[in-house]
Protein backbone atom coordinates (compact mmCIF):
# COMPACT_ATOMS: atom_id res chain seq x y z
CA UNK A 1 0.00 0.00 0.00
CA UNK A 2 2.38 2.24 1.03
CA UNK A 3 4.65 1.87 -1.82
CA UNK A 4 1.80 2.39 -4.10
CA UNK A 5 1.24 5.82 -3.21
CA UNK A 6 4.60 6.49 -3.41
CA UNK A 7 4.58 5.25 -6.90
CA UNK A 8 1.45 7.23 -7.34
CA UNK A 9 2.24 10.57 -6.31
CA UNK A 10 5.45 9.44 -8.37
CA UNK A 11 3.82 9.30 -11.57
CA UNK A 12 1.04 12.21 -10.83
CA UNK A 13 4.82 14.57 -10.24
CA UNK A 14 5.91 13.41 -13.32
CA UNK A 15 3.06 14.33 -15.55
CA UNK A 16 3.38 17.66 -13.53
CA UNK A 17 7.20 17.85 -14.93
CA UNK A 18 5.97 16.65 -18.43
CA UNK A 19 4.09 19.62 -19.66
CA UNK A 20 7.75 21.71 -18.63
CA UNK A 21 9.74 18.16 -19.90
CA UNK A 22 8.54 16.29 -22.25
CA UNK A 23 11.50 13.59 -21.13
CA UNK A 24 13.28 13.21 -17.81
CA UNK A 25 16.39 10.89 -17.00
CA UNK A 26 15.92 9.78 -13.52
CA UNK A 27 18.58 7.58 -11.49
CA UNK A 28 17.77 6.27 -7.69
CA UNK A 29 19.32 7.74 -4.44
CA UNK A 30 19.00 7.81 -1.06
CA UNK A 31 20.19 5.32 1.84
CA UNK A 32 17.02 3.16 0.62
CA UNK A 33 17.37 3.59 -3.13
CA UNK A 34 14.15 5.48 -2.23
CA UNK A 35 14.54 8.65 -3.38
CA UNK A 36 14.77 9.80 -7.47
CA UNK A 37 16.73 12.54 -8.91
CA UNK A 38 16.16 13.54 -12.60
CA UNK A 39 17.40 16.13 -15.12
CA UNK A 40 15.94 16.76 -18.41
CA UNK A 41 16.99 15.04 -20.87
CA UNK A 42 19.41 15.42 -22.52
CA UNK A 43 20.77 17.27 -19.60
CA UNK A 44 23.90 16.05 -17.62
CA UNK A 45 23.83 16.14 -13.42
CA UNK A 46 26.93 16.16 -11.14
CA UNK A 47 26.02 16.61 -7.38
CA UNK A 48 22.22 18.35 -7.39
CA UNK A 49 22.55 19.72 -10.10
CA UNK A 50 21.39 19.48 -13.85
CA UNK A 51 23.26 20.95 -16.69
CA UNK A 52 22.94 22.20 -20.40
CA UNK A 53 25.76 23.10 -22.81
CA UNK A 54 23.58 25.24 -25.53
CA UNK A 55 25.58 25.71 -28.72
CA UNK A 56 23.20 28.67 -29.87
CA UNK A 57 25.44 31.48 -30.62
CA UNK A 58 23.63 34.82 -28.66
CA UNK A 59 24.72 37.59 -25.82
CA UNK A 60 24.50 37.40 -22.07
CA UNK A 61 21.52 38.66 -22.19
CA UNK A 62 19.48 36.39 -24.52
CA UNK A 63 21.78 33.61 -23.03
CA UNK A 64 20.36 34.23 -19.68
CA UNK A 65 16.67 34.40 -21.06
CA UNK A 66 17.54 30.99 -22.75
CA UNK A 67 18.15 29.43 -19.60
CA UNK A 68 15.81 30.71 -17.74
CA UNK A 69 12.64 29.96 -19.96
CA UNK A 70 14.08 26.18 -19.41
CA UNK A 71 13.60 26.63 -15.76
CA UNK A 72 17.31 27.52 -15.43
CA UNK A 73 19.83 29.71 -15.23
CA UNK A 74 23.69 30.85 -16.42
CA UNK A 75 25.60 28.92 -14.34
CA UNK A 76 26.78 29.25 -11.17
CA UNK A 77 30.37 27.68 -10.60
CA UNK A 78 31.02 26.89 -6.89
CA UNK A 79 33.96 24.83 -6.95
CA UNK A 80 36.70 23.22 -8.64
CA UNK A 81 35.43 19.90 -8.95
CA UNK A 82 32.13 21.48 -10.67
CA UNK A 83 33.82 23.38 -13.12
CA UNK A 84 36.18 20.04 -14.24
CA UNK A 85 32.69 18.54 -14.34
CA UNK A 86 31.06 21.26 -16.99
CA UNK A 87 34.64 21.33 -18.90
CA UNK A 88 34.85 17.66 -19.87
CA UNK A 89 31.82 18.46 -21.71
CA UNK A 90 32.93 21.53 -23.34
CA UNK A 91 34.86 22.29 -26.80
CA UNK A 92 37.95 23.79 -26.29
CA UNK A 93 37.78 25.74 -29.35
CA UNK A 94 34.69 27.64 -28.05
CA UNK A 95 33.87 30.07 -25.20
CA UNK A 96 30.72 29.68 -23.41
CA UNK A 97 28.82 32.50 -20.56
CA UNK A 98 28.72 31.51 -17.19
CA UNK A 99 26.14 33.45 -14.73
CA UNK A 100 28.34 36.05 -13.63
CA UNK A 101 28.39 39.66 -14.69
CA UNK A 102 29.48 43.68 -13.69
CA UNK A 103 26.61 45.12 -15.22
CA UNK A 104 28.53 48.33 -13.85
CA UNK A 105 31.70 48.25 -14.56
CA UNK A 106 32.74 48.77 -10.67
CA UNK A 107 34.29 45.49 -10.92
CA UNK A 108 31.68 44.14 -8.74
CA UNK A 109 31.02 40.65 -9.87
CA UNK A 110 27.79 39.50 -9.29
CA UNK A 111 26.76 35.47 -10.06
CA UNK A 112 22.57 35.24 -11.44
CA UNK A 113 21.29 33.65 -8.45
CA UNK A 114 22.70 36.30 -6.16
CA UNK A 115 25.05 34.09 -4.76
CA UNK A 116 27.80 35.65 -3.08
CA UNK A 117 31.06 36.40 -5.22
CA UNK A 118 33.79 34.75 -3.13
CA UNK A 119 37.40 36.07 -4.60
CA UNK A 120 38.83 33.07 -3.50
CA UNK A 121 36.42 30.88 -4.86
CA UNK A 122 37.36 31.82 -8.93
CA UNK A 123 38.93 30.60 -12.14
CA UNK A 124 40.05 33.86 -14.26
CA UNK A 125 42.58 33.17 -16.37
CA UNK A 126 46.28 34.89 -15.36
CA UNK A 127 45.61 38.36 -16.09
CA UNK A 128 41.59 38.71 -16.18
CA UNK A 129 38.90 40.36 -15.79
CA UNK A 130 41.31 43.02 -17.67
CA UNK A 131 38.63 45.67 -18.62
CA UNK A 132 35.61 47.34 -17.19
CA UNK A 133 34.17 47.53 -20.34
CA UNK A 134 33.65 44.00 -20.58
CA UNK A 135 31.50 43.30 -17.86
CA UNK A 136 29.97 39.02 -18.73
CA UNK A 137 32.50 36.12 -18.04
CA UNK A 138 32.80 33.35 -20.24
CA UNK A 139 34.73 30.02 -19.52
CA UNK A 140 37.59 29.19 -22.40
CA UNK A 141 40.79 26.92 -23.02
CA UNK A 142 43.59 28.93 -22.66
CA UNK A 143 47.59 28.00 -21.73
CA UNK A 144 46.45 24.63 -21.58
CA UNK A 145 43.65 24.99 -18.84
CA UNK A 146 40.30 26.12 -18.45
CA UNK A 147 39.54 29.20 -17.25
CA UNK A 148 37.26 32.80 -17.13
CA UNK A 149 37.84 35.93 -18.95
CA UNK A 150 35.54 38.84 -18.94
CA UNK A 151 34.25 39.92 -22.23
CA UNK A 152 31.61 42.69 -23.88
CA UNK A 153 28.43 41.22 -23.09
CA UNK A 154 26.61 41.39 -26.91
CA UNK A 155 29.00 39.81 -28.55
CA UNK A 156 27.48 36.21 -29.08
CA UNK A 157 28.32 33.25 -26.83
CA UNK A 158 27.68 29.20 -26.50
CA UNK A 159 26.42 29.42 -23.26
CA UNK A 160 25.86 27.24 -19.93
CA UNK A 161 22.74 26.60 -18.02
CA UNK A 162 22.09 25.13 -14.56
CA UNK A 163 19.26 24.05 -12.70
CA UNK A 164 18.39 22.26 -9.44
CA UNK A 165 17.67 18.40 -9.49
CA UNK A 166 14.39 17.34 -9.93
CA UNK A 167 12.98 15.94 -7.21
CA UNK A 168 10.09 13.14 -6.86
CA UNK B 1 37.76 68.03 -25.75
CA UNK B 2 37.51 64.81 -27.60
CA UNK B 3 39.32 64.75 -31.01
CA UNK B 4 38.99 61.39 -33.50
CA UNK B 5 40.35 62.03 -36.52
CA UNK B 6 40.18 59.68 -39.20
CA UNK B 7 42.97 58.93 -42.26
CA UNK B 8 44.22 57.04 -44.91
CA UNK B 9 40.86 56.67 -47.03
CA UNK B 10 41.20 57.14 -51.00
CA UNK B 11 40.39 55.35 -54.16
CA UNK B 12 41.40 51.86 -54.36
CA UNK B 13 41.08 48.86 -56.95
CA UNK B 14 38.85 45.79 -56.15
CA UNK B 15 40.60 43.26 -54.58
CA UNK B 16 42.90 45.92 -53.45
CA UNK B 17 43.79 47.18 -49.62
CA UNK B 18 43.64 49.63 -47.39
CA UNK B 19 44.95 50.85 -44.10
CA UNK B 20 42.63 53.67 -42.10
CA UNK B 21 44.38 55.54 -39.16
CA UNK B 22 42.33 57.22 -36.21
CA UNK B 23 44.46 59.80 -34.05
CA UNK B 24 42.74 59.82 -30.68
CA UNK B 25 43.65 63.01 -28.43
CA UNK B 26 41.36 64.42 -25.31
CA UNK B 27 41.07 60.74 -23.91
CA UNK B 28 43.17 58.30 -22.12
CA UNK B 29 42.64 56.44 -25.39
CA UNK B 30 44.21 53.25 -23.74
CA UNK B 31 41.25 52.55 -21.81
CA UNK B 32 38.43 52.88 -24.14
CA UNK B 33 36.69 50.09 -26.18
CA UNK B 34 37.14 51.63 -30.05
CA UNK B 35 34.63 50.96 -32.92
CA UNK B 36 35.02 51.51 -36.68
CA UNK B 37 31.25 52.28 -38.57
CA UNK B 38 30.70 52.98 -42.04
CA UNK B 39 28.04 54.59 -44.05
CA UNK B 40 28.01 54.23 -47.88
CA UNK B 41 27.11 57.00 -49.99
CA UNK B 42 23.61 58.36 -49.07
CA UNK B 43 22.50 55.05 -47.26
CA UNK B 44 22.41 54.31 -43.60
CA UNK B 45 24.91 53.48 -40.94
CA UNK B 46 26.75 50.08 -40.26
CA UNK B 47 28.81 48.47 -37.51
CA UNK B 48 32.38 47.11 -39.41
CA UNK B 49 34.52 46.27 -36.24
CA UNK B 50 34.83 46.70 -32.38
CA UNK B 51 38.08 46.15 -30.35
CA UNK B 52 38.25 46.49 -26.80
CA UNK B 53 41.21 48.69 -24.70
CA UNK B 54 43.83 46.03 -24.66
CA UNK B 55 43.33 44.63 -28.24
CA UNK B 56 43.27 41.31 -27.04
CA UNK B 57 39.27 40.68 -28.56
CA UNK B 58 37.90 41.92 -31.64
CA UNK B 59 34.78 41.89 -33.40
CA UNK B 60 33.21 41.73 -36.62
CA UNK B 61 30.23 41.32 -38.35
CA UNK B 62 29.95 38.56 -41.33
CA UNK B 63 30.23 41.10 -43.86
CA UNK B 64 34.01 41.90 -43.20
CA UNK B 65 35.00 39.01 -41.07
CA UNK B 66 38.04 37.39 -42.65
CA UNK B 67 38.86 40.52 -44.73
CA UNK B 68 39.16 43.25 -42.19
CA UNK B 69 41.31 43.55 -39.50
CA UNK B 70 41.09 46.00 -36.56
CA UNK B 71 43.90 47.09 -33.64
CA UNK B 72 45.45 49.49 -32.05
CA UNK B 73 48.38 51.29 -30.73
CA UNK B 74 48.03 52.39 -27.39
CA UNK B 75 51.74 54.33 -26.99
CA UNK B 76 50.39 55.98 -30.19
CA UNK B 77 46.63 56.36 -29.19
CA UNK B 78 46.12 55.26 -32.73
CA UNK B 79 43.46 53.29 -33.95
CA UNK B 80 43.67 50.87 -37.19
CA UNK B 81 41.30 49.33 -39.90
CA UNK B 82 43.13 46.99 -42.15
CA UNK B 83 41.00 46.18 -45.16
CA UNK B 84 41.87 43.58 -47.62
CA UNK B 85 40.20 41.70 -50.76
CA UNK B 86 37.60 45.51 -51.19
CA UNK B 87 35.20 44.92 -53.03
CA UNK B 88 32.82 47.52 -54.49
CA UNK B 89 30.06 47.43 -51.85
CA UNK B 90 32.74 48.33 -48.81
CA UNK B 91 32.83 51.86 -50.37
CA UNK B 92 31.66 54.41 -47.44
CA UNK B 93 32.61 56.66 -45.35
CA UNK B 94 34.38 55.46 -42.72
CA UNK B 95 34.04 56.69 -38.83
CA UNK B 96 35.61 55.85 -35.86
CA UNK B 97 34.04 55.55 -32.29
CA UNK B 98 34.36 55.97 -28.75
CA UNK B 99 32.34 53.16 -27.03
CA UNK B 100 30.99 53.11 -23.85
CA UNK B 101 29.67 50.29 -21.95
CA UNK B 102 25.40 50.93 -20.42
CA UNK B 103 24.83 47.74 -18.22
CA UNK B 104 24.77 44.79 -20.51
CA UNK B 105 24.88 46.92 -23.84
CA UNK B 106 26.88 50.41 -25.38
CA UNK B 107 26.79 53.30 -26.63
CA UNK B 108 29.13 55.01 -29.42
CA UNK B 109 29.37 58.72 -28.14
CA UNK B 110 32.34 60.58 -29.89
CA UNK B 111 32.74 59.75 -33.23
CA UNK B 112 35.32 61.39 -35.48
CA UNK B 113 34.53 63.63 -39.03
CA UNK B 114 35.34 59.79 -41.22
CA UNK B 115 37.93 59.20 -44.15
CA UNK B 116 36.16 58.07 -47.26
CA UNK B 117 37.27 55.18 -48.73
CA UNK B 118 36.13 54.43 -52.63
CA UNK B 119 36.69 51.03 -54.59
CA UNK B 120 36.38 51.02 -57.66
CA UNK B 121 38.09 49.89 -61.21
CA UNK C 1 20.87 39.79 -36.77
CA UNK C 2 18.53 41.79 -34.88
CA UNK C 3 16.70 43.81 -37.54
CA UNK C 4 15.80 47.83 -36.50
CA UNK C 5 12.89 48.94 -38.53
CA UNK C 6 12.13 52.87 -39.18
CA UNK C 7 9.17 54.87 -39.45
CA UNK C 8 8.49 57.19 -41.45
CA UNK C 9 11.23 57.05 -43.45
CA UNK C 10 11.08 61.15 -43.55
CA UNK C 11 9.06 63.59 -41.90
CA UNK C 12 8.52 67.05 -42.27
CA UNK C 13 7.04 69.55 -39.21
CA UNK C 14 6.54 72.83 -38.40
CA UNK C 15 8.69 74.76 -36.38
CA UNK C 16 7.64 74.56 -32.54
CA UNK C 17 6.00 71.20 -33.20
CA UNK C 18 6.21 68.16 -32.52
CA UNK C 19 7.99 65.33 -34.13
CA UNK C 20 7.80 61.68 -33.63
CA UNK C 21 10.03 58.66 -35.35
CA UNK C 22 9.28 55.17 -34.51
CA UNK C 23 11.57 52.06 -34.27
CA UNK C 24 10.70 48.71 -33.89
CA UNK C 25 13.32 45.92 -33.14
CA UNK C 26 12.20 42.01 -34.70
CA UNK C 27 13.03 40.88 -31.25
CA UNK C 28 13.00 42.28 -27.51
CA UNK C 29 16.04 44.13 -26.70
CA UNK C 30 15.31 44.47 -23.22
CA UNK C 31 16.95 43.00 -20.32
CA UNK C 32 16.60 43.46 -16.36
CA UNK C 33 14.86 46.76 -16.80
CA UNK C 34 16.93 48.53 -19.07
CA UNK C 35 16.44 48.78 -23.32
CA UNK C 36 19.66 48.23 -25.03
CA UNK C 37 18.14 51.35 -27.80
CA UNK C 38 20.06 54.27 -28.77
CA UNK C 39 19.33 57.26 -30.83
CA UNK C 40 21.79 59.03 -32.91
CA UNK C 41 21.50 62.27 -35.14
CA UNK C 42 23.41 63.17 -38.08
CA UNK C 43 23.17 66.56 -39.77
CA UNK C 44 24.48 66.82 -43.60
CA UNK C 45 28.19 66.07 -43.93
CA UNK C 46 28.95 65.12 -40.24
CA UNK C 47 28.84 62.63 -38.62
CA UNK C 48 26.41 60.96 -36.49
CA UNK C 49 26.12 62.62 -32.68
CA UNK C 50 24.74 60.55 -30.01
CA UNK C 51 21.34 61.78 -28.40
CA UNK C 52 19.68 58.68 -26.44
CA UNK C 53 20.92 55.67 -24.94
CA UNK C 54 19.10 53.48 -23.04
CA UNK C 55 15.89 53.55 -24.87
CA UNK C 56 15.12 57.18 -22.62
CA UNK C 57 18.58 58.48 -21.22
CA UNK C 58 19.23 61.94 -22.78
CA UNK C 59 22.67 62.36 -23.27
CA UNK C 60 24.46 65.12 -21.93
CA UNK C 61 24.61 68.31 -23.37
CA UNK C 62 21.50 67.43 -25.81
CA UNK C 63 19.08 69.56 -25.52
CA UNK C 64 15.38 68.20 -23.81
CA UNK C 65 13.17 68.81 -26.41
CA UNK C 66 14.74 65.52 -27.62
CA UNK C 67 13.22 62.34 -25.62
CA UNK C 68 13.31 58.89 -25.78
CA UNK C 69 10.54 56.21 -24.90
CA UNK C 70 9.42 52.32 -25.20
CA UNK C 71 10.41 48.74 -24.28
CA UNK C 72 10.57 45.49 -25.64
CA UNK C 73 10.49 45.86 -29.07
CA UNK C 74 8.77 49.67 -30.17
CA UNK C 75 10.55 52.35 -29.27
CA UNK C 76 9.91 56.53 -30.32
CA UNK C 77 12.29 58.97 -30.50
CA UNK C 78 10.52 62.92 -30.02
CA UNK C 79 10.95 65.98 -30.74
CA UNK C 80 8.53 68.08 -29.33
CA UNK C 81 8.76 71.29 -30.22
CA UNK C 82 11.24 71.29 -34.06
CA UNK C 83 13.76 73.93 -34.13
CA UNK C 84 15.74 74.72 -37.31
CA UNK C 85 19.05 73.22 -36.31
CA UNK C 86 17.43 69.71 -36.09
CA UNK C 87 17.18 69.63 -39.37
CA UNK C 88 18.57 65.86 -39.58
CA UNK C 89 18.61 62.34 -40.19
CA UNK C 90 17.62 60.18 -37.37
CA UNK C 91 18.99 56.57 -36.52
CA UNK C 92 18.29 54.12 -33.53
CA UNK C 93 20.67 51.33 -33.09
CA UNK C 94 20.32 48.05 -30.66
CA UNK C 95 23.34 46.82 -28.88
CA UNK C 96 21.67 44.36 -26.83
CA UNK C 97 23.58 42.06 -29.32
CA UNK C 98 26.10 41.53 -32.47
CA UNK C 99 25.79 42.45 -35.14
CA UNK C 100 24.75 46.46 -33.66
CA UNK C 101 22.33 47.25 -36.06
CA UNK C 102 20.94 50.50 -37.30
CA UNK C 103 17.56 51.44 -38.50
CA UNK C 104 17.70 52.99 -41.47
CA UNK C 105 17.19 56.42 -40.56
CA UNK C 106 14.65 58.84 -41.08
CA UNK C 107 15.04 62.71 -42.27
CA UNK C 108 13.16 65.35 -40.70
CA UNK C 109 12.69 68.75 -42.60
CA UNK C 110 10.49 71.94 -42.05
CA UNK C 111 7.01 72.39 -43.47
Known amino acids: NFMYSKTVKRLSKLQEYQQYYPSLTCVMEGKDMEDWSCCPTPWTSFQSSCYFISTVMQSWTKSQNNCSVMGADLVVINTKEEQDFITQNLKINSAYFLGLSDPKGWRHWQWVDQTPYNKNVTFWHSGEPNSPDERCAIINFRSEEWGWNDVHCHVPQKSICKMKKIYI | EVQLLESGGGLVQPGGSLRLSCAASGITFSTYTMSWVRQAPGKGLEWVAT????????YYPDSVKGRFTISRDNSKNTLYLQMNSLRAEDTAVYYC??????????????WGQGTTVTVSS | DIVMTQSPDSLAVSLGERATINCKAS??????????VNWYQQKPGQPPKLLIYGASNLESGVPDRFSGSGSGTDFTLTISSLQAEDVAVYYC?????????FGGGTKVEIK
Open chain 3, 93 to 101: QQSDEDPWT
Open chain 2, 51 to 58: INSGGDNT
Open chain 3, 27 to 36: QSVDYDGNSY
Open chain 2, 97 to 110: ATYRPYYYGSVLDY
